[in-house]
């Protein structure tokens, strides 16, 4: 089931998606699409990165975080009710049947009537707390570094905290990384 994220009409919406590059700048293609992740690629692509850069985007959709460090979280600018729905973040790891697929549900609420606009929170790369875990099957001879890592199964359980947290840069500053797979 999809993790749900909320935003108000006129605000920017934030949909988190992360991976760990094998080395700085050693990027993996990522696509974002409107609609649930299909068997291959993304449907209705709104943004795409390649091994070097963002190579396709549409208006109002951008990456606010540092995608060169694996933060490929999507920001949708000035949302309307029509932006509600499922979005797919697909991390396109080379080889067959390796892609990591994340379906995220965006719910847009009508804007509250407020006396003055408030500044949109900065959600650049925040996980307010993380349990780190290693161990993915048997010990292996081929690993690239021994970074602390976070099992992605934990992400969905922390999604609500992520949305409401103001601790934006603690995780990045700690050097922790998220482990895919």
């Amino acid at each position: 089931s999809e993790v749900e994220y909320r935003a108000e009409v006129g605000q920017n919406a934030y949909l988190p998606c992360f991976y760990t590059p094998a080395a700085p700048g050693n990027l993996v293609p990522v696509c974002w699409g409107k609609g649930a992740c299909p068997v291959f690629e993304c449907g209705n692509v709104v943004l795409r990165t390649d091994e070097r850069d963002v190579n396709y985007w549409t208006s109002r959709y951008w990456l606010n975080g540092d995608f060169r460090k694996g933060d490929v979280s999507l920001t949708i600018e000035n949302v309307t009710l029509a932006d509600s729905g499922i979005y797919c973040c697909r991390i396109q790891i080379p080889g067959i049947m390796n892609d990591e697929k994340f379906n995220l549900k965006l719910v847009i609420k009508p804007a509250k009537v407020t006396p003055a606009p408030t500044r949109q929170r900065d959600f650049t790369a925040a996980f307010p707390r993380m349990l780190t875990t290693r161990g993915h099957g048997p010990a292996e001879t081929q690993t690239l570094g021994s970074l602390p890592d976070i099992n992605l199964t934990q992400i969905s359980t922390l999604a609500n905290e992520l949305r409401d947290s103001r601790l934006a840069n603690d995780l990045r500053d700690s050097g922790a990384t998220i482990r895919i797979g």
Epitope: T20, P94, G95, N98, I180
Partner: antibody, heavy 124, light 106 residues
Framework: EVQLQQSGAELARPGASVKLSCKAS????????MQWVKQRPGQGLEWIGA????????RYTQNFKGKATLTADKSSSTAYMQLSSLASEDSAVYYC?????????????????WGQGTTLTVSS | DVQMIQSPKSMSMSVGERVTLSCKAS??????VSWYQQKPDQSPKLLIY???NRYTGVPDRFTGSGSATDFTLTISSVQAEDLADYHC????????FGSGTKLEMK
């Protein structure tokens, strides 16, 4: 300890269908692809298809589309393969195998645990 | 589909000899090649993945090498328990396997 326990040998008539099972234990069933592989006597291995129980994603090789149907029951951590319209050339040992996929950091892509195999004999 | 061609079909060796098995892919598969050992009446077992990485618990007499289209499995000093069929497989695209090499003892 990871284990894949397959159902027992099957004898079937031409034209019939059979459903083979593979019960997984010792790991999180929904987090790994389950693959199915065919081996005819004295021959090599032939990949049939795979299912990802976590989201129900299924892949088939062209040769087995319409022949094999893969399903998975998350509650019992069991994968199934139904083979239909059986013919003598479907006589083989069928293996289920867990797939360890690559991450952005480590290249894997291999079959790391295999079931003991189910022997299917198709004969009139 | 990517074709994987193994050679030889079979070979007869004496204990202590060096064995080299070959596997050629019909197109570039990078290093997405694994080697599996299958003893008589048993399931296959993973030996090598990523063309050259020895799987957990595999004796160091087994070594994999190669990339792109040409791959080799070497057994530096063959033992009686190595009597088996050896299969190479690629997993860059949907998995395909070679037809196997049968290793027999003289």
């Amino acid at each position: 300890e990871v284990q894949l326990q397959q159902s027992g040998a099957e004898l079937a008539r031409p034209g019939a269908s059979v459903k083979l099972s593979c019960k997984a234990s010792g790991y999180t069933f929904t987090s790994y692809w389950m693959q199915w592989v065919k081996q005819r006597p004295g021959q090599g291995l032939e990949w049939i298809g795979a299912i990802y129980p976590g989201d129900g994603d299924i892949r088939y090789t062209q040769n087995f589309k319409g022949k094999a149907t893969l399903t998975a029951d998350k509650s019992s951590s069991t994968a199934y393969m139904q083979l239909s319209s059986l013919a003598s050339e479907d006589s083989a040992v069928y293996y289920c195998a867990r797939w360890e996929k690559s991450t952005t950091v480590v290249q894997r892509n291999y079959f790391d645990y295999w079931g003991q195999g189910t022997t299917l004999t198709v004969s009139s | 589909d990517v074709q994987m061609i193994q050679s030889p079909k079979s070979m007869s060796m004496s204990v202590g000899e060096r064995v080299t098995l070959s596997c050629k892919a019909s197109e570039n598969v990078g290093t997405f090649v694994s080697w599996y050992q299958q003893k008589p009446d048993q399931s296959p077992k993973l030996l090598i993945y990523g063309a050259s990485n020895r799987y957990t618990g595999v004796p160091d007499r087994f070594t994999g090498s190669g990339s792109a289209t040409d791959f080799t499995l070497t057994i530096s000093s063959v033992q009686a328990e190595d009597l088996a069929d050896y299969h190479c497989g690629q997993s860059y695209s949907y998995p395909t396997f070679g037809s196997g090499t049968k290793l027999e003892m003289k």
